[in-house]
Amino acid sequence: SEVEYRAEVGQNAYLPCFYTPAAPGNLVPVCWGKGACPVFECGNVVLRTDERDVNYWTSRYWLNGDFRKGDVSLTIENVTLADSGIYCCRIQIPGIMNDEKFNLKLVIKPAKVTPAPTRQRDFTAAFPRMLTTRGHGPAETQTLGSLPDINLTQISTLANELRDSRLANDLRDSGATIRIG
């Protein structure tokens, strides 16, 4: 059964997923998808990393942690009830049937209070503005304009708690992490 995570409408939801790179910078491709993990890759992909960088993402989905150190936890910005459901984190370790896959269940609850006015900052510096994504036909490059501003105050309770290293370690010990090498 899937591990369950909760957030309120309007907050940012946090879905933890970690691995330990065999060596610094020796990254493993990871995909996140909406829906349980299928046989290969992720279904309804919302974000991918390759051996170097985030190479595909859709609006509202981003990696807040240091993915170069194996923190590939997904943040979903400003969630709605429609964001409820199962999400797949797949760590595509090279080899014969080596993939590690984790199904995480996100439960969105109606907001209790109206959010207060929020500070905003430009998030575009965190990611390159050009990304090349795999696709059919000729290689395609998407040019992105400014990425959405990120609401710093709209971080879910769980995400705030995860900044506490003790809880982060608990999560790592709970099975949503994999050591490589």
């Epitope: 290969f40 994504t133 795999r134």
Partner: antibody
Framework: EVQLVESGGGLVKPGGSLRLSCAAS????????MTWVRQAPGKGLEWVAS????????YYLDSLKSRFTISRDNAKNSLYLQMNSLRAEDTAVYYC????????????????WGQGTLVTVSS | DIQMTQSPSSLSASVGDRVTITCRAS??????LTWYQQKPGKSPKLLVY???TLAEGVPSRFSGSGSGTDFSLTISSLQPEDFANYYC?????????FGQGTKLEIK
């Protein structure tokens, strides 16, 4: 036009080996997962093995992974299946298939198939 | 392994008929189901993926439905070119598995 052309099939004795090839054209081969599926005479379809874009990740039917090896050469737009220690029950038409892919999708179903190559294992 | 069971194994129908083929998975596969058509001596052709999405170029008389363990493929008005074998395939669990097939014949 997308084309997948298999070759390398034929008659082989039990315990023998064969290497099947699949030549791909009409698309960017390195953007796609590729798969081998087989079909014994008069029978249904059976998945054999799949390989990811760059060949670093491979997937097999458990009962075949000790004898069969899937590989690819993106520079040559080619997919391969090395089959060792062949048995009579490996007799089948072997199809090369492309994993359907578009942005935000996953390559778990197959949108183009080759015409197949027949492998017959018999003494 | 996830077992896929198709029914019926064979079906006789006439041009213009509405026919439905069903596929049952041995466990929940969500919507990770694909349908293929195969004519004798030919390679399979993708018809429907993710249980209900019609593949490019497939006539609208074909439709897929279902989720979880029970799925169906419906042809609303059979055409002469539709007489063929049909296979379902799940892509939730490793290994990928196919149904045993349904042979659709002319009555």
């Amino acid at each position: 036009e997308v084309q997948l052309v298999e070759s390398g099939g034929g008659l082989v004795k039990p315990g023998g080996s064969l290497r099947l090839s699949c030549a791909a054209s009409g698309f960017t081969f390195s953007d796609y997962y590729m798969t081998w599926v087989r079909q014994a005479p008069g029978k249904g379809l059976e998945w054999v093995a799949s390989i990811n874009y760059d060949g670093r990740n491979t997937y097999y039917l458990d009962s075949l992974k000790s004898r069969f090896t899937i590989s690819r050469d993106n520079a040559k737009n080619s997919l391969y299946l090395q089959m060792n220690s062949l048995r009579a029950e490996d007799t089948a038409v072997y199809y090369c298939a492309r994993g359907y892919y578009y942005y935000g999708s996953s390559p778990n179903y197959f949108d183009y198939w080759g015409q197949g190559t027949l492998v017959t294992v018999s003494s | 392994d996830i077992q896929m069971t198709q029914s019926p194994s064979s079906l006789s129908a006439s041009v213009g008929d509405r026919v439905t083929i069903t596929c049952r998975a041995s466990e929940n596969i969500y919507s990770y189901l694909t349908w293929y058509q195969q004519k004798p001596g030919k390679s399979p052709k993708l018809l429907v993926y993710n249980a209900k999405t019609l593949a490019e170029g497939v006539p609208s008389r074909f439709s897929g439905s279902g989720s979880g363990t029970d799925f169906s493929l419906t042809i609303s008005s059979l055409q002469p070119e539709d007489f063929a074998n049909y296979y379902c395939q799940q892509h939730y669990g490793t290994p990928l598995t196919f149904g045993q097939g349904t042979k659709l014949e002319i009555k």
